[in-house]
């Protein structure tokens, strides 16, 4: 007869490991007992369990409650055992020693490999601002056994660098993603992808990029000069800009206070029926935590009874 086992048994942390040991005997041969031991190099054999044809299963105190026989029906020639709830410390060499009648004793070894799936974490880098050079966008760390693979999935152009730290029974891998911040990256996903044999599918952690910027400001509403005449209703100026974080708007009049009746509504300045009092220089001040911008326009309210043309100056300042 001969023993059938596996060279390597691989399980994921917390799963049950089946340690196979089957005696393929000739007709009439019987298995008296199967002794299981852990036999790591440099250490003495440590009893795991004994399966006896008459006495049943004996489990070593060190493994009490963790070793069982596979569920029935059981073949009397099958000396396999289940090691419940495998932990990293269970990884190593195991030996089954089978006593048969009349053929004598046989032994076989296997290696138990316990996969420890990683629990990845993603850490964003410092705040990204337009105009910076190459900057850390995020780092992703995953520790497991064996070492996990850490990659990035994104449309954003950047560079990656990885480093690995080996521990006694695992390895930690950290990958960093660097980029040159630009406003086009705003809202773009940056995904850390962790692969590992202990995972059914890759683990993905997505970070949305936020790049601080503030665009030049401009004012709209004075495109048709003829509309700015005495008595006109619904006249308005709108300040145009964009930024991250979203900017706030403030309107002032350079040559005095805002005329009565003029309404400020965020980026919009609304006028009552126009009078010559509304002529003047108006300033839109745009700001966010990153920067601030100004844009100013000159409003000249015309009297339709006058023949002279309307003069408009547009000045933009930063």
């Amino acid at each position: 007869g001969e023993l059938e086992t596996s060279d390597v048994v691989t399980v994921v942390l917390g799963q049950d490991a089946k340690l196979p040991c089957f005696y393929r005997g000739d007709s009439g041969e019987q298995v008296g007992q199967v002794a299981w031991a852990r036999v790591d190099a440099g250490e003495g054999a440590q009893e795991l369990a004994l399966l006896h044809s008459k006495y049943g299963l004996h489990v070593s105190p060190a493994y009490e409650g963790r070793v069982e026989q596979p569920p029935p029906p059981r073949n009397p020639l099958d000396g396999s055992v289940l090691l419940r709830n495998a932990v990293q410390a269970d990884e190593g060499e195991y030996e089954c020693r089978v006593s048969t009648f009349p053929a004598g004793s046989f032994q076989a070894r296997l290696r138990l490999r316990v996969l420890v799936p990683p629990l990845p974490s993603l850490n964003p880098g410092p705040a990204l601002e337009e105009g910076q050079g190459l900057t850390l966008a995020a780092s992703c760390t995953a520790e497991g056994s064996p070492a996990p693979s850490v990659t990035w999935d994104t449309e954003v152009k950047g560079t990656t660098s990885s480093r690995s730290f080996k521990h006694s029974r695992s390895a930690a891998v950290t990958s960093e993603f660097h980029l040159v911040p630009s406003r086009s990256m705003n809202g773009q996903p940056l995904t850390c992808v962790v692969s590992h044999p202990g995972l059914l599918q890759d683990q993905r952690i997505t970070h949305i990029l936020h790049v601080s910027f503030l665009a030049e400001a401009s004012v709209r509403g004075l495109e048709d000069q003829n509309l700015w005449h005495i008595g006109r209703e619904g006249a308005m100026l709108k300040c145009l800009s964009e930024g991250q974080p979203p900017p706030s708007y403030n309107w002032t009049r350079l040559d005095g206070p805002l005329p009565s009746g003029v309404r400020v509504d965020g980026d919009t300045l609304g006028f009552p029926p126009l009078t010559t009092e509304h002529s003047g220089i108006y300033v839109c001040h745009v700001s966010n935590e990153f920067s601030s911008r100004d844009s100013q326009v000159t409003v000249d309210v015309l009297d339709p009874q006058e023949d002279s043309g309307k003069q408009v100056d547009l000045v933009s300042a930063s």
């Epitope: 002794a35 031991a37 009893e47 006495y55 299963l57 004996h58």
Partner: antibody, heavy 123, light 107 residues
């Protein structure tokens, strides 16, 4: 036929010492783990000590640990129990018994027993 | 240590009676249980090993059953020579421990 014969029992004062022997015949002595079991007058059976076939890995009941020493001479097919610092509560019939070592620290039931030797500890 | 609890501690029966003695272990011991018979002034004699296996030379009226924590010794038809004290013993762990014994007396 397998025979186990104990000797060395007797009357001893508290604090005294005694050495029990168990001579085995009729089978291969070195194949078996041996143990001592005692029975106080009118009481039940109490395991005292055990020893591997090779003579190592000695085990003791808490009640005798540090006072009793088990040993064997495989060349003489003999088991011993050295008893020191004897107490009145050690008074009992001492039996030697054999069992087969299955693996590690796992044994069969004890299939053969000696007739016993009486140890009396009294002043 | 594993505690072995035997019951009853004594019983009276007549020749031909069916006698049952139970033994409970404080924790699972698979089938690492033996039953011994002891007569006054004599050494214990192995009757049953591995919970249910009959030792060579022991009459078939003796039988054992059970596994784990609960075990039973049955004498199907009590004979005059069966009046004695019976002990169960676990040898799953060291120290091996015995039940307190069951004395079977003539009614």
């Amino acid at each position: 036929e397998v025979q186990l014969v104990e000797s060395g029992g007797g009357l001893v004062q508290p604090g005294g010492s005694l050495r029990l022997s168990c001579a085995a015949s009729g089978d291969i002595f070195t194949n078996y783990s041996m143990s001592w079991v005692r029975q106080a007058p009118g009481k039940g059976l109490e395991w005292v000590s055990g020893i591997y076939p090779s003579g190592d890995n000695n085990r003791y009941a808490d009640s005798v640990k540090g006072r009793f020493t088990i040993s064997r001479d495989n060349s003489k097919n003999t088991l011993y129990l050295q008893m020191n610092s004897l107490r009145a509560e050690d008074t009992a019939v001492y039996y030697c018994a054999r069992a087969e070592l299955l693996a590690f620290d796992v044994y069969t039931a004890s299939d053969y027993w000696g007739q016993g030797t009486l140890v009396t500890v009294s002043s | 240590d594993i505690q072995m609890t035997q019951s009853p501690s004594s019983l009276s029966a007549s020749v031909g009676d069916r006698v049952t003695i139970t033994c409970r272990a404080s924790q699972g011991i698979s089938s690492y249980l033996a039953w011994y018979q002891q007569k006054p002034g004599k050494a214990p004699k192995l009757l049953i090993y591995a919970a249910s296996s009959l030792q060579s030379g022991v009459p078939s009226r003796f039988s054992g059953s059970g596994s784990g924590t609960d075990f039973t010794l049955t004498i199907s038809s009590l004979q005059p020579e069966d009046f004695a004290t019976y002990y169960c013993q676990q040898h799953y762990t060291t120290p091996p421990t015995f039940g307190q014994g069951t004395k079977v007396e003539i009614k």
